[in-house]
Interface confidence: low
């Protein structure tokens, strides 16, 4: 902690100026009145502080503020900002966009994947549901941070905004981020023809359930084997030889060079050897000809 | 297919203005940022900007922040990039291009304002 | 504002020959959040405007050839032709979309022996 002493006369702070670049971590921790430091949040980023003096800013702001800093601080942190951890920052309370930005900006080539992701949470939770500008801004300067989101939060996005989400910007959802996504952008673009529908609802299609995947293998949209490899293993298992090739269109030859990898290995599996031929790749590991195929899941169900 | 047709070649006087305009086509026209990039004759590229057509809001190299004004017309699918105080060094050619996410997918074909009293 | 620094200037190929752009950040351009590196590779033809070849640095565009490839990550960056052909003559600018300004290199002027 820092040592407690009392300030020089000749060191009294009376603005957040350069001269207290001088100042050593005790003089700023005696001289520095924490409501002035608030008051003049915006100056503290255009001074040069070290790392150990922005430490002693940042206490002095947490004693002023235990439950919290108000998001006029917030909006001026700059690259105070680097010092927060996620503990502090579930404290906040932000729902402007410019904020936001702020910060993002701060944290660009810093380690701060947690911090970015707790903020982020904060505005979703003060802007009380993630609308069409969050995600604006969050595709504009944070790239792949949408998928930082929980799915609980992700569920507060309206179908309206979907429109907005960027390819990318899914890059690095997960499984249960997809399940939550992928209903609401079936949604947002279903007036679409089928050609448009599949390239607006590819990126998303990690939530696709086996139904709708059947669906667009009638469709002729020739799936790349990159979204078909991120496809739920659930609603790849059920989908026959001839679905899958209808599925994949000319792609259907890039199953070869993924045959040992998820989800590919488990279909093919599940299906049997002869059905598997009749594609020319050599696929092989399916159930042997003449074998009787009995789904026991089904038959506990019964029982 | 995607096009961006920019309006025709310019030439202004020092401490003029110019507006080149930028009409796209083959897409939906708020879905995507317009950039602006300019080319002096014989040198390399430089980002001015751009605007995010749907909510109008726009980010500006600092270079220009004081000099260029991005707007969009949404009736007429039509990106603008208005110029002010010009000089000499400014004689460009002045692309708006779509983004693809931030990198420059599509470009115009380009509008050569030239400056000279 | 990040400085992108390529190398060489200007680059004279054989035909059927490889070629090779180097491309420097003054920053790194990898976005840890999403493990992407926000830099892209533009093509200029003489009298045209530039074109796009690879973005996220190594994603090709759809309907460049596969002989262009973009590799690198952090700071530093590469462009390679497998084996150049005379349609590939021109200047060769790599940028950075990963932060505000996006900034591009100075270019690198690719001719044919």
């Known amino acids: 902690d820092v040592e407690r002493t009392t300030c020089p006369p000749e060191k009294e702070v009376h603005e957040i100026d350069e001269s207290l670049i001088f100042y050593k971590k005790r003089e700023l921790e005696a001289c520095v009145d924490a409501a002035l430091l608030a008051a003049q949040m915006d100056r503290v980023d255009a001074i040069p502080f070290t790392y150990e003096q922005l430490d002693v800013l940042k206490h002095k702001l947490d004693e002023l503020y235990p439950q919290g800093y108000p998001e006029s601080v917030i909006r001026h942190l700059g690259h105070l900002f680097l010092k927060m951890s996620p503990e502090d920052i579930r404290k906040w309370n932000v729902t402007s966009l410019e904020t936001l930005k702020a910060l993002l900006k701060v944290s660009k080539g810093h380690e701060m994947s947690a911090q970015v992701a707790t903020l982020i949470d904060r505005v979703v939770v003060g802007r009380g549901q993630l609308d069409k500008d969050t995600v604006d801004t969050l595709t504009a300067f944070c790239p792949g941070c949408l998928c930082s989101l929980s799915p609980e939060r992700l569920s507060s996005v309206p179908p309206s905004v979907i429109g907005a989400v960027r390819p990318q910007d899914l890059d690095t959802c997960g499984p249960r981020q997809l399940d939550v996504l992928y209903p609401k952008a079936r949604l947002a673009f279903q007036n679409m023809s089928g050609s448009e529908y599949f390239v607006k609802i590819r990126p998303f299609l990690g939530g696709a359930p086996t139904e709708d995947v059947k669906a667009l293998s009638q469709q002729n949209v020739s799936m790349d084997l990159a979204t078909f490899m991120k496809l739920r293993r659930e609603a790849v298992l059920p989908l026959t030889v001839a679905e899958v090739q209808k599925l994949l269109g000319p792609h259907v030859e890039g199953l070869k060079v993924e045959e040992q990898h998820s989800p590919v290995r488990d279909w093919i599996l599940k299906q049997r050897q002869d059905d598997l031929d009749t594609l020319g790749l050599g696929l092989q590991g399916g159930i042997p000809n003449g074998y009787l195929i009995l789904d026991l899941s089904v038959r506990e169900a019964l029982s | 297919e995607v096009q961006l047709v920019q309006s025709g070649a310019e030439v202004k006087k020092p401490g003029a203005s110019v507006k080149v305009s930028c009409k796209a086509s083959?897409?939906?026209?708020?879905?995507?940022?317009m950039h602006w990039v300019r080319q002096a004759p014989g040198q390399g590229l430089e980002w001015m900007g751009n605007?995010?057509?749907?909510?109008?809001?726009?980010y500006y190299n600092e270079r220009f922040m004081s000099r260029v004004t991005m707007t969009v017309d949404k009736s007429t699918s039509t990106a603008y990039m208005e110029l002010s105080s010009l000089r000499s060094e400014d004689t460009a050619v002045y692309y708006c291009?779509?983004?693809?996410?931030?990198?420059?997918?599509?470009w115009g074909q380009g509008t050569l304002v030239t400056v000279s009293s | 504002d990040i400085v992108m620094t390529q190398t060489p200037l200007s680059l004279s190929v054989t035909p059927g020959q490889p070629a090779s752009i180097s491309c420097k950040s003054s920053?790194?351009?990898?976005?840890?959040?999403?493990?992407?590196?926000?830099l892209a590779w533009y093509q200029q033809k003489p009298g045209q405007s530039p074109t796009l070849l690879v973005y996220?640095?190594?994603t090709r565009e759809s309907g460049v050839p596969d002989r262009f490839s973009g590799s690198g990550s952090g700071t530093d960056f590469t462009l390679k032709i497998s084996r150049v052909e005379a349609e590939d003559v021109g200047v060769y600018y790599c940028?950075?979309?990963?932060?505000?300004?996006?900034?591009f290199g100075g270019g690198t002027k690719v001719e044919i022996k």
């Open positions: 940028q950075q979309h990963y932060r505000t300004p996006y900034t």
């Open positions: 920053q790194t351009l990898l976005n840890s959040v999403s493990q992407n590196n926000y």
């Open positions: 291009a779509r983004s693809g996410g931030l990198w420059l997918a599509f």
């Open positions: 083959g897409y939906t026209f708020t879905n995507y940022w």
């Open positions: 996220f640095a190594s």
């Open positions: 605007i995010n057509p749907s909510s109008g809001d726009s």
